[in-house]
Amino acid sequence: MMTGTIETTGNISAEKGGSIILQCHLSSTTAQVTQVNWEQQDQLLAICNADLGWHISPSFKDRVAPGPGLGLTLQSLTVNDTGEYFCIYHTYPDGTYTGRIFLEVLESSVAEHGARFQIP
């Protein structure tokens, strides 16, 4: 069985008050993506459904924007946004693929992007 791979933006950092794009990409599979969920630890941020489009959780509507693509843009970052984010790809027939991103929001103006990595 050929299974896919989730590529994410990995460990990233951004400046307080700024914005950041969270991106995941599913490759090496012909599975059909039916839905992508974005979660911050134990909170649902957004859903992108293949048929119904985007839904942003009400509590994040002011600071979360859909896209680009299946990614998610976080705006007006605060230090409380530091933590783990998960992209969850619901596919058929493979099942569910999960990618992890760690975001660190920095007080200083020095914010470097980490290297991309893959979760097999």
Partner: nanobody, 131 residues
Framework: EVQLAESGGGSVQAGGSLRLSCTTS????????MGWFRQAPGKEREGVAT???????????TYADSVKGRFTISLDKAKNTVYLQMNSLKPEDTAMYYC?????????????????????WGQGTQVTVSS
């Protein structure tokens, strides 16, 4: 120590229904992949259904083509139990049914019935469907 215990198997006529239960002990729920597999005599073990439940309590089920529309997998965290509701049973559904689970927060892709390498397995419950 994590333990999975299946129950609910038995003998049933074709067209009938059964509900299998898999009760977990020593297992925590966070970001979980759990599923049901089966093995008929002389055949390889095959995936039936899996359920992915996130830390935000969203869930997604995936089914093998052979059971889609007939079987339903669900999880009751409060009862530490995963269920497999089996309707419109066929003689070819006869097999030993096993519950499987990944360690919590293990990211092992994909969570689906075609993936064989789950971390924990139960002892199985027998389902026999006669025509």
């Amino acid at each position: 120590e994590v333990q999975l215990a299946e129950s609910g198997g038995g003998s049933v006529q074709a067209g009938g229904s059964l509900r299998l239960s898999c009760t977990t002990s020593g297992y925590t729920y966070s970001r979980n992949c759990m599923g049901w597999f089966r093995q008929a005599p002389g055949k390889e073990r095959e995936g039936v259904a899996t359920i992915y439940v996130s830390a935000a309590s969203t869930s997604f089920a995936t089914y093998a083509d052979s059971v889609k529309g007939r079987f339903t997998i669900s999880l009751d965290k409060a009862k530490n139990t995963v269920y497999l509701q089996m309707n419109s049973l066929k003689p070819e559904d006869t097999a030993m049914y096993y519950c499987a689970a990944d360690p919590p927060d293990r990211i092992s892709n994909p969570c689906g019935p075609r993936r064989p390498d789950f971390g924990y397995w139960g002892q199985g419950t027998q389902v026999t469907v006669s025509s």
